[in-house]
């Protein structure tokens, strides 16, 4: 913490300006009034403060706003945002997308994924839902940031907004997030024709259940291996060799290249070797001929 001293009369600060860059940390602490700083936050980012001086300014704001900064201050944080921790940001209430844009721009190129994720979370909470304007802002200023939101937050996305989401925005989404987004996407694109529907739903298929994957296999979609590999393991395992062949179409030969990777490896282990041989790809590891498969989990459930 900065040591408290009295401000020398000649150093008294009446406005936030460039002269402050010559103040020592101790002088800044003693001479800058926190309320003045908050009122003139829009000037701070134009002044080339050192990181040490920014620490002092942050300390002043923290003292003035122990419950969290008001949005009027947050909007003008500029490079002071780089000093914020997720814990600081968690206290904020942000509703303005202009504020979000400003801070996303500042954070670019800095290792601030935790802070940005918390900021986006606060915006979603502040606005009440993940509306189209918020999604548009995220896709424009922070590709991939959508996936920093928890499944709970993502559940507030109305299906009507899903169309604004681009494939690259989902690149870092995990299975739990796609589980939430997939049903919304299915609803949003339900009136589209087969091929158009597949193009739109493709980035969300990591959340698709087996029934939907089976249904796609009947629609000549020729799913590429990249999409197939992103499907949930549980959705792939029940598929038959014939269904996978139909689903992948000409891309089926890619199974050979990916045979060591999950979910292909796990799927191969569940198929009869006879059936795998019909693909003519030399896939090995299926259940040998004449072997009986007992599902012990069913037996346990009955006992």
């Amino acid at each position: 913490d900065v040591e408290r001293t009295t401000c020398p009369p000649e150093k008294e600060v009446h406005e936030i300006d460039e002269s402050l860059i010559f103040y020592k940390k101790r002088e800044l602490e003693a001479c800058v009034d926190a309320a003045l700083l908050a009122a003139q936050m829009d000037r701070v980012d134009a002044i080339p403060f050192t990181y040490e001086q920014l620490d002092v300014l942050k300390h002043k704001l923290d003292e003035l706003y122990p419950q969290g900064y008001p949005e009027s201050v947050i909007r003008h944080l500029g490079h002071l945002f780089l000093k914020m921790s997720p814990e600081d940001i968690r206290k904020w209430n942000v509703t303005s997308l202009e504020t979000l844009k400003a801070l996303l721009k500042v954070s670019k190129g800095h290792e601030m994924s935790a802070q940005v994720a918390t900021l986006i979370d606060r915006v979603v909470v502040g606005r009440g839902q993940l509306d189209k304007d918020t999604v548009d802002t995220l896709t424009a200023f922070c590709p991939g940031c959508l996936c920093s939101l928890s499944p709970e937050r993502l559940s507030s996305v109305p299906p009507s907004v899903i169309g604004a989401v681009r494939p690259q925005d989902l690149d870092t989404c995990g299975p739990r997030q796609l589980d939430v987004l997939y049903p919304k996407a299915r609803l949003a694109f339900q009136n589209m024709s087969g091929s158009e529907y597949f193009v739109k739903i493709r980035p969300f298929l990591g959340g698709a259940p087996t029934e939907d994957v089976k249904a796609l296999s009947q629609q000549n979609v020729s799913m590429d291996l990249a999409t197939f590999m992103k499907l949930r393991r549980e959705a792939v395992l029940p598929l038959t060799v014939a269904e996978v062949q139909k689903l992948l179409g000409p891309h089926v030969e890619g199974l050979k290249v990916e045979e060591q990777h999950s979910p292909v490896r796990d799927w191969i282990l569940k198929q009869r070797q006879d059936d795998l041989d019909t693909l003519g790809l030399g896939l090995q590891g299926g259940i040998p001929n004449g072997y009986l498969i007992l599902d012990l989990s069913v037996r346990e459930a009955l006992s």
């Epitope: 494939p167 690259q168 690149d171 590429d224 291996l225 990249a226 197939f228 590999m229 992103k230 891309h251 030969e253 890619g254 199974l255 050979k256 290249v257 990916e258 045979e259 060591q260 990777h261 999950s262 790809l281 030399g282």
Partner: antibody, heavy 119, light 108 residues
Framework: EVQLVQSGAEVKKPGASVKVSCKAS????????MDWVRQAPGQGLEWMGD????????IYNQKFNGRVTMTEDKSASTVYMELSSLRSEDTAVYYC????????????WGQGTTVTVSS | EIVLTQSPATLSLSPGERATLSCSAS???????LSWYQQKPGQSPRLLIY???NLASGIPARFSGSGSGTDYTLTISSLEPEDFAVYYC?????????FGGGTKVEIK
């Protein structure tokens, strides 16, 4: 423009580890596996293994098993290859190479990272 | 593992001549799973041909590939000065993926 940018040259002592990074840009990171291929001075190419950035799943050439670890950071579109228990025979240029999932050919290569193992 | 043997190890030719490079596999390779790369000194390899005979993007038509089973060929119909380099075949038909030892095409 599709690019793979690798980290700089490294000099290591025998027994140490090295971690090489490969940052991808200009394409959908999770639609391509990232493979690692090395080339000893004046020698041919040797495939080390690959990682699926979507799942984090890896396959390693058994020759390197237990010594090589490949990881990814989706948020940074970066993959890493760490080789441990280095010996002089590991002196080589290490390349990351992009491979579209479902194909086995490498259509884009990194510029290479020279790793020198010397006591 | 499948061993790929390239021959000859060195090919000395003049610009304008035809170059024929061979790649022989120790066991059968599915033809969809063979490719060729070019590497110049101090540079990364570059994809030339994939799936035995498909030309990669930006590769001139003087390059062509053929073959099946255990025997594959890369042909350069008329050598240009920029074609003098080392060429590698590569298979991903069987794990682990392997490369041939390379053929150096040098100026005679």
């Amino acid at each position: 423009e599709v690019q793979l940018v690798q980290s700089g040259a490294e000099v290591k002592k025998p027994g140490a580890s090295v971690k090489v990074s490969c940052k991808a840009s200009g394409y959908t990171f999770t639609d391509y596996n990232m493979d690692w291929v090395r080339q000893a001075p004046g020698q041919g190419l040797e495939w080390m293994g690959d990682i699926n950035p979507s799942t984090g799943g890896t396959i390693y050439n058994q020759k390197f098993n237990g010594r090589v670890t490949m990881t990814e950071d989706k948020s940074a579109s970066t993959v890493y290859m760490e080789l441990s228990s280095l010996r002089s025979e590991d002196t080589a240029v290490y390349y990351c190479a992009r491979r579209r999932i479902g194909t086995g050919y490498f259509d884009v290569w990194g510029q290479g990272t020279t790793v020198t193992v010397s006591s | 593992e499948i061993v790929l043997t390239q021959s000859p190890a060195t090919l000395s030719l003049s610009p304008g001549e035809r170059a024929t490079l061979s790649c022989s596999a120790s066991s059968s390779v599915i033809s969809s799973y063979l490719s060729w790369y070019q590497q110049k000194p101090g540079q990364s390899p570059r994809l030339l041909i994939y799936r035995t005979s498909n030309l990669a993007s930006g590769i001139p038509a003087r390059f062509s590939g053929s073959g099946s089973g255990t025997d594959y060929t890369l042909t350069i119909s008329s050598l240009e000065p920029e074609d003098f380099a080392v060429y590698y075949c590569h298979q991903w038909s069987s794990f682990p993926y392997t490369f041939g030892g390379g053929t150096k095409v040098e100026i005679k």
